[in-house]
């Protein structure tokens, strides 16, 4: 029984429990991809434990194996709008520090209006997730359909 | 070597382990647009640790932050069937208690036959998740196709 | 303190946290369905920590309930070119040892060109999963586009 | 700079059809819908459809579904709209128009193309 | 197709005044998060410039005297301080779904 109380006193930080679930705020400027994302209880059932936001961009402070998944649903969108737009992709990626800039998860929503997947990737303290969004449609903003999350794993 | 030991001795319930993946029991009467599910060795691959099933839908027996996936296939469906009888949307959401009514993941079939995805939500005992398929077609119950399940992540 | 310091003595091994990332080699012989994967640092991001390869398939090393996720991306690919070569499907499951071989998860394109999945279960020492992929259109190696994990979660 | 130029005024007869160009420049033609848009003297303005230079699909108000057809030349990063049996009631000013990220909203406008109908 | 109103048809205020413009949408144009609303201002002779997209957003190179605001039928265009280059007609502009329409209009003049 000592080691149950042990763990419950233990921060959960010391766990390396880091987790994040994110909603989408708004879109960037003319020429930025990138969409902008905000968290924490006040907003519904985003959250952060651990990562923070850097200017909407989702920052890593543990080193680590993480889950990294995203749901991205565009808005007023049909199979016929989405064939009518120029082709939407949605790329999630280390955007900085530049020297570890690499793509790590890319859909096109092709004739579909919801992309959704996850992957497992090693993540490193100060890395900055960014998901850039091309097309010309715009992502639905409602928590059930648009969000983005990272899980710690393992060291 | 002592705290491994520990570890083995503790019962896994006290680690917040709890975790379930059901397969698909039978879609609702007429109205009711809930799928309901079903889960057990006896039955497959599928399982309850922790959470229960209460007239088919996932009861939360555990406080925290879990993972919640799903996929749901349409039977005798091809993209011409599907753009057809749209839209066939999926909800899953929190339906009681009624206070904590909400949905938390959303997606529809458009041109497709499947959808899957997964998020981060918090979830308190109690909690019972519903899954609302809304259209004309009819989910598969092959296992392989379609399932549904949450991972407690952390408190 | 102590319990901190034990745990992080401890080899992971012993806390079950087996985890793999893989990444597309190479498409099998004519009459072999089945994709070959490949993992370790020096390719990227993909790792194995537990799970080993077995002429490119994934061998578990580790009972527990696993979480599988999948997202495969057909190559040079639209929706045109999907809905011409209809279907491909994609498999995931347990294809030895014999006796416990079942489909786990399986995706139809449709007329998308990327499928991308997950789901828990449970899985024994020495399973190997095997994902096929039926169709005449090739997968895409890029590294992003392309991948196949498992993650331990429970016992 | 992003632009789009019209070509110029035109006079028909009732009955006849007239083909307004769009000409667009500083940007890859094939990324964006171009929108069309007409104004009736001292009226306001009535969307009629956009077509997707990428693949040449249009969608049409209903309300000219039957009488306009939207097409694209690649090759000279040119759109046109063209409007068959022509009434007293068309005679506007036609413009094409451009969003500037999303799809919705229109931040580029052609200078506009005069047509009158007129026996 | 959903009916834009909007009110008054014209309106005079003295420079340096607060003008308000109203559009009222026969259903609902606010989903996925947005409210999809646009303002344009035309002068005579020019083609129509857009001044606020998705209700409240202010367009690159637009003063900020211009502002937007409501959600689901019922939204403003508010010039904050009246100058003399405002005097022109105003239009809103849904996009929530196809046919995309718009006001009738609202002409801004110098009392």
């Known amino acids: 029984q000592r080691f149950a109380q042990a763990q419950q006193q233990l921060p959960l930080e010391s766990l390396g429990w880091d987790v994040a679930e994110l909603q989408l705020n708004h879109t960037g400027p003319q020429q930025d991809p990138r969409l902008y994302w905000q968290g924490g209880p006040a907003l519904g059932r985003s959250f952060l434990h651990g990562p923070e936001l850097d200017k909407g961009q989702l920052r890593i402070h543990r080193d680590g194996i993480y889950m990294v998944h995203i749901q991205v649903t565009l808005a007023i969108c049909s199979s016929t709008t989405a064939s009518r737009h120029h082709p939407t992709t949605l790329a999630v990626g280390i955007c900085s520090p530049a020297s570890r800039s690499i793509s790590l998860l890319r859909l096109s929503f092709h004739q579909g209006c919801t992309i959704a997947s996850q992957r497992l990737t090693p993540l490193a303290r100060g890395d900055t997730l960014c998901t850039n969004l091309t097309g010309t449609l715009l992502p639905s903003r409602n928590t059930d359909e648009t969000f983005f999350g990272v899980q710690w794993v393992r060291p | 070597q002592r705290f491994a030991q520990a570890q083995q001795q503790l019962p896994l319930e006290s680690l917040g382990w709890d975790v379930a993946e059901l397969q698909l029991n039978h879609t609702g009467p007429q109205q009711d647009p809930r799928l309901y599910w079903q889960g057990g060795p006896a039955l497959g691959r599928s399982f309850l640790h922790g959470p229960e099933l209460d007239k088919g839908q996932l009861r939360i027996h555990r406080d925290g932050i879990y993972m919640v996936h799903i996929q749901v296939t349409l039977a005798i469906c091809s993209s011409t069937t599907a753009s057809r009888h749209h839209p066939t949307t999926l909800a899953v959401g929190i339906c009681s208690p009624a206070s904590r009514s909400i949905s938390l993941l959303r997606l529809s079939f458009h041109q497709g036959c499947t959808i899957a995805s997964q998020r981060l939500t918090p979830l308190a005992r109690g909690d019972t998740l519903c899954t609302n398929l809304t259209g004309t077609l009819l989910p598969s119950r092959n296992t392989d196709e379609t399932f549904f399940g949450v991972q407690w992540v952390r408190p | 303190q102590r319990f901190a310091q034990a745990q992080q003595q401890l080899p992971l091994e012993s806390l079950g946290w087996d985890v793999a990332e893989l990444q597309l080699n190479h498409t099998g012989p004519q009459q072999d369905p089945r994709l070959y994967w490949q993992g370790g640092p020096a390719l990227g991001r993909s790792f194995l920590h537990g799970p080993e390869l077995d002429k490119g398939q994934l061998r578990i090393h580790r009972d527990g309930i696993y979480m599988v996720h999948i997202q495969v991306t057909l190559a040079i690919c639209s929706s045109t070119t999907a809905s011409r070569h209809h279907p491909t499907t994609l498999a995931v499951g347990i294809c030895s040892p014999a006796s416990r071989s079942i489909s786990l998860l399986r995706l139809s394109f449709h007329q998308g060109c990327t499928i991308a999945s997950q789901r828990l279960t449970p899985l024994a020492r020495g399973d190997t999963l095997c994902t096929n992929l039926t169709g005449t259109l090739l997968p895409s190696r890029n590294t992003d586009e392309t991948f196949f994990g498992v993650q331990w979660v429970r016992p | 700079e992003v632009q789009l130029v019209q070509s110029g005024a035109e006079v028909k007869k009732p009955g006849a059809s007239v083909k307004v160009s769009c000409k667009a420049s500083?940007?890859?033609?094939?990324?964006?819908?171009i929108h069309w848009v007409r104004q009736a003297p001292g009226q306001g303005l009535e969307w009629m459809g956009d077509?997707?230079?990428?693949?040449?699909?249009?969608s049409y108000n209903q309300k000219f579904r039957d009488r306009v057809t939207m097409t694209r030349d690649t090759s000279t990063s040119t759109v046109y709209m063209e409007l068959s049996s022509l009434r007293s009631e068309d005679t506007a000013v036609y413009y094409c128009?451009?969003?500037?990220?999303?799809?919705?909203?229109?931040?580029?406008w052609g200078q506009g193309t005069l047509v009158t109908v007129s026996s | 197709d959903i009916v834009m109103s909007q009110s008054p048809d014209s309106l005079a205020v003295s420079l340096g005044e607060r003008a308000t413009i109203n559009c009222r949408a026969s259903?609902?144009?606010?989903?996925?998060?947005?409210?999809?609303m646009h303002w344009y201002q035309q002068k005579p002779g020019q083609p129509p410039k857009l001044l606020i997209y998705?209700?409240?957003n202010l367009e690159s190179g637009v003063p900020d005297r211009f502002s937007g605001s409501g959600s689901g039928t019922n939204f403003t265009l508010t010039i904050s301080s009246l100058q003399a280059e405002d005097v022109a007609v105003y239009y809103c502009q849904h996009s929530r779904e196809l046919p995309y329409t718009f006001g009738g209009g609202t002409k801004v003049e110098i009392k």
């Open positions: 128009a451009r969003f500037s990220r999303f799809d919705g909203w229109f931040a580029y």
């Open positions: 077509i997707y230079p990428g693949n040449g699909d249009a």
């Open positions: 500083g940007y890859t033609f094939t990324t964006y819908n």
């Open positions: 259903r609902s144009v606010s989903t996925s998060g947005y409210s999809y």
């Open positions: 998705l209700a409240s």
